[in-house]
């Protein structure tokens, strides 16, 4: 099973998503090796000549790094000995999407694994009561999405109801001309009900809930990345 006396080691990655304009992480773990100087980590990207990142003999070696990644990558150096080869990526761009390979060589052997990295934009929605409207309405806003998401409303009381006729959604291009601000208004809302605004694209799904009663307004938001794992 070994090659030249070396064995295959288990390397594990998982599909993840990067939010453009922010830090991202390409996750990769391997069987730990206490001999740090014997560990080589190489990150490669399909279609790119040169390396995304290389770490060997206890330090970074960027001599073969492709220019598009210069100054944008780092491993978590203090975690390499415990089997963490994950890569930190600065200022994620749409062009960073693709298939990456995490290649590991240690004194125990070698191994590699691929991961699919998706890039886009996703953000938490905020729902507020829109008191400016002629009738009671709710305004759901999320500052940054890409690709353009779908927006749907739901209600606890009217489960399964279609709110598309009583809502209006708009997408406004942000200043960097890639991401968009999502605004959706739901009209004719009733009190003592919980409404949900759901925003979803192929990368992420976000939900904002608002409970409106006579005495208070309660809000909750959550964001989940899709197809991770």
């Amino acid at each position: 099973f070994g090659i030249s006396g070396k064995h295959f080691i288990t390397v594990t990655t998982f599909t993840s998503a990067g939010n453009i304009g922010e830090d991202g992480t390409l996750s990769c773990t391997f069987e730990p090796d206490i001999k740090l100087n014997g560990i080589v980590i190489q990150w490669l990207k399909e279609g790119i000549k040169g390396l995304v990142h290389e770490f060997k003999e206890g330090k970074d070696d960027l001599s073969q790094q492709h220019e598009m990644f210069r100054g944008r990558t780092a491993v978590f150096a203090d975690q390499v000995v415990v089997g963490n080869a994950s890569l930190r990526l600065k200022n994620v761009q749409l062009t960073d999407a693709g298939t990456y390979t995490c290649y590991i060589h240690t004194s125990k052997g070698k191994g590699n694994a691929n991961l699919e990295y998706k890039t886009g934009a996703f953000s938490m929605p905020e729902i507020n009561v829109d008191y400016n409207a002629s009738s009671e309405s709710l305004r759901c806003e999320a500052p940054r999405w890409f690709p353009q998401p779908t927006v749907a409303w739901a209600s606890q009381v009217d489960q399964g109801a279609n709110f598309s006729e009583v809502s209006n959604t708009s997408f406004e291009l942000n200043s960097e001309n890639v991401t968009m601000k999502v605004v959706s208004v739901l009209y004719n809302v009733t009190i003592n009900n919980t409404y949900s605004c759901m925003i979803e694209n192929d990368i992420a799904k976000a939900t904002g809930d608002i409970k409106v009663t006579d005495s208070e307004v309660k809000r909750r938001s959550q964001l989940e990345l899709l197809n991770s794992g």
């Epitope: 304009g21 330090k59 960027l62 944008r72 600065k90």
Partner: antibody
């Protein structure tokens, strides 16, 4: 403890060149970017450029391109800033600073004490 | 290149005041905005990076926020040692850029 120690003050004539050094200690010199920033008397901070000592890669402010060269000597853990064709408006305190994040170019988190360069005829 | 426009250029405030300084990026979106404090004759000191992350050892009265092109440094309750000049830095672009600075003076 991260320390950046810069060379002493310089007085130069217009048209001359100056080379300021920045000796690093307390961390692995080749693993972190080093940047250079200047501050003219009573003025704000101005980014000049930076270098990755592990590979010698550099980035420069367009304003200084052609007049500035940033180099390093890994054997002495020292970074250098050389500015040529000096003019009076280059009179400033020049700072070196380590960039946070190792090979990832982060914000400048540790600074040298500054070197005053005076350009006067 | 991304430019940073900082305002105000100076402000007068009293101990205990809440102070807000803003920086506007000329383009794009990224979270790579840092804030520095500088006192006369001294090197700048990093307070906040990545828009809102407090540098270790920096008092919690300093906070950063922002998104899109607009970024803010807030000092919740000004202390005597906070009278200084503050600079923003954008470091997401290949070419870094500082704001023009805000001098915080005693009223």
């Amino acid at each position: 403890e991260v320390q950046l120690v810069q060379s002493g003050a310089e007085v130069k004539k217009p048209g001359a060149s100056v080379k300021v050094s920045c000796k690093a200690s307390g961390y692995t010199f080749t693993s972190y970017w080093i940047g250079w920033v200047r501050q003219a008397p009573g003025q704000g901070l101005e980014w000049i450029g930076d270098i990755y000592p592990g590979g010698g890669y550099t980035n420069y402010n367009e304003k200084f391109k052609g007049r500035v060269t940033i180099t390093r000597d890994t054997s002495t853990s020292t970074a250098y800033l050389e500015l040529s064709s000096l003019r009076s408006e280059d009179t400033a305190v020049y700072y070196c600073a380590r960039l946070d994040g190792s090979s990832y170019r982060g914000a400048m988190d540790s600074w040298g004490q500054g070197t005053l360069v005076t350009v006067s005829s | 290149d991304i430019q940073m426009t900082q305002s105000p250029s100076s402000l007068s405030a009293s101990v205990g005041d809440r102070v807000t300084i803003t920086c506007k990026a000329s383009q794009g979106f990224n979270k790579y905005v840092a804030w520095y404090q500088q006192k006369p004759g001294k090197a700048p000191k990093l307070l906040i990076y990545y828009t809102s992350t407090l540098q270790p050892g920096v008092p919690s009265r300093f906070s950063g926020s922002g998104s899109g092109r607009d970024y803010t440094l807030t000092i919740s309750s000004l202390q005597p040692e906070d009278f200084a000049t503050y600079y923003c830095l954008q470091y997401g672009d290949l070419l870094y850029a500082f704001g023009q600075g805000t001098k915080v003076e005693i009223k």
